[in-house]
Amino acid sequence: EDELQVIQPEKSVSVAAGESATLRCAMTSLIPVGPIMWFRGAGAGRELIYNQKEGHFPRVTTVSELTKRNNLDFSISISNITPADAGTYYCVKFRKGSPDDVEFKSGAGTELSVRAKPS
């Protein structure tokens, strides 16, 4: 019970093209210390969607204030969804390391499907 778990409550989310997609993720613990990252896909070829620590992600906004003390909600919203955004998104907790952070635990993934824009 005490070990950190990564909760991605929706296994699938369907969004119309042009809309925003909210991908929910929360941690059950503040420990271990380290950043959260969102990826599309798994394995070596996965694509970084959001890095809590650094980087510029113009289409991504965080749902809650990540700098807030004791925040455990790392949900994100991706704007202006297109069919190219379809895929499975993983919320991943990293453990702070030196020189590099180490992947600690991943959520189960949320499959994003994109519907045609209503005419």
């Epitope: 019970e1 990564v6 909760i7 409550p9 296994k11 699938s12 059950t28 959520g107 189960a108």
Partner: antibody, heavy 126, light 112 residues
Framework: QVQLVQSGAEVKKPGSSVKVSCKAS????????ISWVRQAPGQGLEWMGG????????NYAQKFQGRVTITADESTSTAYMELSSLRSEDTAVYYC???????????????????WGKGTTVTVSS | DIVMTQSPLSLPVTPGEPASISCRSS???????????LDWYLQKPGQSPQLLIY???NRASGVPDRFSGSGSGTDFTLKISRVEAEDVGVYYC?????????FGGGTKVEIK
């Protein structure tokens, strides 16, 4: 072991609201989805919505959207379901339910309903 | 929303005999991790529902091994190898792949 204790039976007038509580004991409260399921007399089970307290916001079935509010108070390990604009068709037994452990987190299986409350009977009558 | 269809509506059984209930979903409940997000519940008369089978084929804690779940994708079956008198009640399947969770209409199992 995990237990869910629900508030007592209610009799309400059409157009009014009802708020049913569900207190969890045993296990961690914040990390588990609490679902609310209702059963009208002689009818089947109907999922109204659910909340994982750690997120603060709930998911609702479209049928109840705008009429139901599900909340959770982490300080008392209690979930609430409020249904407004009551009509006679809302006469039912309302259950809360939740999973018991986190072993299936890695599978994304959050809405398991291993443990159920005994149900709260809500009667809507003029 | 995913539509769940159960059959039969009513199932008269003889104690000691096997019984089978079918559940069909309007879309596949098989997720990319290989699990089917389909659960089975039994509601005995005057009681709250109780979980029998989760993720398609896994027996819940304390559930007798005469209960088994099978199937994948859109077609699922709950089998009782030898029905006992205490097994009477209404059986429901429910999909847990996505919210809103949706239940089948129920199958009432009664002793002949």
């Amino acid at each position: 072991q995990v237990q869910l204790v629900q508030s007592g039976a209610e009799v309400k007038k059409p157009g009014s609201s009802v708020k049913v509580s569900c207190k969890a004991s045993g296990g961690t409260f914040s990390n588990y989805a609490i679902s609310w399921v209702r059963q009208a007399p002689g009818q089947g089970l109907e999922w109204m919505g659910g909340i994982i307290p750690i997120f603060g916001t709930a998911n609702y079935a479209q049928k109840f959207q705008g009429r139901v509010t599900i909340t959770a108070d982490e300080s008392t390990s209690t979930a609430y379901m409020e249904l407004s604009s009551l009509r006679s068709e809302d006469t039912a037994v309302y259950y809360c339910a939740r999973p018991v452990d986190s072993s299936s987190y890695s599978l994304g299986y959050y809405y398991g309903m291993d443990v159920w409350g005994k149900g709260t009977t809500v009667t809507v009558s003029s | 929303d995913i539509v769940m269809t159960q059959s039969p509506l009513s199932l008269p059984v003889t104690p000691g005999e096997p019984a089978s209930i079918s559940c069909r979903s309007s879309q596949s409940l098989l997720y990319s991790n290989g699990y089917n997000y389909l659960d089975w519940y039994l509601q005995k008369p005057g009681q709250s529902p109780q979980l029998l089978i989760y993720l398609g084929s896994n027996r819940a804690s304390g559930v007798p091994d005469r209960f088994s779940g099978s199937g994948s994708g859109t077609d699922f079956t709950l089998k009782i190898s030898r029905v006992e008198a205490e097994d009477v009640g209404v059986y429901y399947c429910v999909q847990a792949l996505q919210t809103p969770l949706t239940f089948g209409g129920g199958t009432k199992v009664e002793i002949k």
